[in-house]
Structure formats: structure tokens, C-alpha cells
């Protein structure tokens, strides 16, 4: 069930809150409510100031890598979720993420999912 | 079918003011962002402001910042650019183009007008 | 802000390859769009999102981003590619969309 600060969106985003040591990947799944004939599907770090990084994109059937090949995005098999993952994550890799789906045309739409926190913590 | 009309430019002289109007039909208007982008003559495009689908907020590029006003009446499907002080170097093709936005995800200018001529000179 | 550098121009022969790139500071974070734009005519939007075809786009155009720098390549130059080429991303800092300079394209 959807709590009261996460409502029902068409692009979920889990966990809410993931903590890692760094070294470790990072994992969250994007799942969509529904499959849409054409769609991209990028995966973006929100900075403080409301900026925001694509990491890495889904695209038509091809993964397309960002700026850094850390960051890496797997279709599952039943089609509608997506793992993100960071391979190794660092300590300044904690922040605030999200994903999002842009349905192309003839129905272009801009669904984004809730945002995640990600935290890495020093390795102990 | 998608139509974005500009109208509005004319010959001004420099100092002078100009209302541009953009007349959009075959799409949910109040749904979009909307931009102006201009072209001056043999140079690139040149993104001159945006609009929120709601009309709330708005944002120019800084050559044109406390002159030019965009707005929108999403009850008559048009988008306006408000243009005062003129000057020579604001003389170009003006378009106007549609946009589909999320929140922090931004999308793409889809649709563009023919555009229409604003010439400042005296 | 946030600057694309393109070439002026390039010269293409007839049916070979055209490799048009743009760079940008870490442009491999950003969607990056392009347009073909014919003398007296509108901007066409040609590719998006790095490196989709909008309908109607032949299949010759196609785009790709890694790193800084994004490519737009069409595979055969025809004589009705001859056009100038831009590039497009948005600029979260500045909150603007940032146009390249453009690339004056002709086919020999």
C-alpha cells in the first residue's frame, strides 16, 4: 500500500530510503504501471538545488550508459521494472534519486517516479 | 493536426514595444510548457523564454530579462511575448514552440511554429 | 552557462557517411536533441533523447551521446540533407535551453 507521503504514481521508485557501505552496489527497481508502445526511460541524481544528472537511460531496447559506466540500468524480464544499480558506491554518491519515463508521441507524456535517498556510509 | 500561428512582428524602431501572439490548435495547450526561441538573421536559434503550463512560472534569457514578458490565456490558446525597449540586436525570427514537462524531468520542444519577423531598426 | 560547440560547416560526399558532433561539459548527463533546419524554413526536430527518430525521420539519421561529446550521424548523405544542423539540451542550472552554434552541412 501507497503511505500518505508516497502516493500512487504510474512510475514507482524502491526502496524509499537505501543504505550501503561504500564498496557495495547500490540497487533501486523503477517499475511502470504500464507498458507504453515507445518510451525512454532515464534515471536521474537530484541535486540540492533541484538539478538534475541523467545517470543512465533506457531507450527503445538499448541501454544507453551515462557519463559514468558505474551507473547501470537492467530490464527485468516481466518488462515493466528496472533495476538501477550503482556498481562500488562511493561516499559522495548519497543523495536523492529518481526515475523518469518519457511516453513518445502519439501520447508523449512525462511521468517521473517519488524520490529515494540513498546513503553510503563508510565502510566499518 | 498540431499548428502553432505566430503573428505580430513588424518594423519597430529601437526603444519601441511589440506584442507577439502564438495561436495554438490540435493539442491540449494547457498541458504544455511553452517557449519563444528567436534567430537573428544567419545566426543559430536562440531560446528566449518559457511558461509554465499553468502560467506560474517563467524564465528568460538574460539578454531579454526585465524587457520581455511571456504569458499565456490558456482559455483562448494562445501564448504572448511582450516586447519593450527594443533594441537592434533583438531583430530575428521569432517561433514559438510547445513543450511536455514533469516536475524535474524535462522533455523536448516538439512543436514549433513558421515564426515571424521582428525587425528593430530607426 | 552552459556552452555546445559544433564545427561550422562540413562537406559530405553523396551517399557517404556524415558525422556531425556537439560537445559539452559532461553532455552524456543531459538529453541532448537535434534539428535540421532548411534555408527559410522552421527547425525540424530530427532526433531526440540522444538518439531517437521522431516519426517521418528517414532512417539514415541517427544519434548518439557518450562522455562529451554527442553525434549526430546520418549513414548515406543525400543531396536534401544539405541543411544546417543544431544541437539542444537543457541547462538545469540556468534553467534554459541551450542551442549549439550550428553545423552548415553540404553534400558534395
Known amino acids: 500500500l501507497d503511505s500518505p507521503d508516497r502516493p500512487w504514481s504510474p512510475l514507482t521508485f524502491s526502496p524509499a530510503q537505501l543504505t550501503v557501505q561504500e564498496g557495495e552496489n547500490a540497487t533501486f527497481t523503477c517499475s511502470l504501471a504500464d507498458i507504453p508502445d515507445s518510451f525512454v526511460l532515464n534515471w536521474y541524481r537530484l541535486s540540492p538545488r533541484n538539478q538534475t544528472d541523467k545517470l543512465a537511460a533506457f531507450q527503445e531496447d538499448r541501454i544507453e550508459p551515462g557519463r559514468d559506466r558505474r551507473f547501470r540500468v537492467t530490464r527485468l524480464p516481466n518488462g515493466r521494472d528496472f533495476h538501477m544499480s550503482i556498481v562500488a558506491a562511493r561516499l559522495n554518491d548519497s543523495g536523492i534519486y529518481l526515475c523518469g519515463a518519457i511516453y513518445l508521441p502519439p501520447n508523449t507524456q512525462i511521468n517521473e517516479s517519488p524520490r529515494a535517498e540513498l546513503s553510503v556510509t563508510e565502510r566499518t | 493536426e498540431v499548428q502553432l500561428v505566430e503573428s505580430g512582428g513588424d518594423l519597430v524602431k529601437p526603444g519601441g514595444s511589440l506584442r507577439l501572439s502564438c495561436v495554438a490548435s490540435?493539442?491540449?495547450?494547457?498541458?504544455?510548457?511553452m517557449n519563444w526561441v528567436r534567430q537573428a538573421p544567419g545566426k543559430g536559434p536562440q531560446w528566449v523564454a518559457y511558461?509554465?503550463?499553468?502560467?506560474?512560472?517563467?524564465n528568460y534569457v538574460d539578454a531579454v530579462k526585465g524587457r520581455f514578458t511571456i504569458s499565456r490565456d490558456n482559455a483562448k490558446n494562445t501564448l504572448y511575448l511582450q516586447m519593450n525597449s527594443l533594441r537592434a540586436e533583438d531583430t530575428a525570427v521569432y517561433y514559438c514552440a510547445s513543450e511536455i514537462r514533469g516536475v524535474v524531468v524535462v522533455g523536448h520542444l516538439d512543436y514549433w511554429g513558421q515564426g515571424t519577423l521582428v525587425t528593430v531598426s530607426s | 552557462s552552459y556552452v555546445l560547440t559544433q564545427l561550422p560547416s562540413k562537406s559530405v560526399t553523396l551517399n557517404q557517411p556524415a558525422h556531425i558532433t556537439c560537445g559539452g561539459d559532461n553532455i552524456g548527463s543531459k538529453s541532448v536533441h537535434w534539428y535540421q533546419q532548411k534555408l527559410g524554413q522552421a527547425p525540424v526536430l530530427i532526433i531526440y533523447y540522444d538518439s531517437i527518430r521522431p516519426t517521418g525521420i528517414p532512417e539514415r539519421f541517427s544519434g548518439a551521446t557518450s562522455g562529451n561529446t554527442a553525434t549526430l550521424t546520418i549513414s548515406g548523405a543525400l543531396a536534401e540533407d544539405e541543411a544546417d544542423y543544431y544541437c539542444?539540451?537543457?541547462?538545469?542550472?540556468?534553467?534554459?535551453?541551450?542551442f549549439g552554434e550550428g553545423t552548415q552541412l553540404t553534400v558534395l
Open positions: 539542444q539540451v537543457w541547462d538545469s542550472s540556468a534553467k534554459a535551453w541551450v
Open positions: 511558461i509554465n503550463n499553468a502560467g506560474s512560472d517563467r
Open positions: 490540435g493539442f491540449t495547450f494547457s498541458r504544455y510548457y
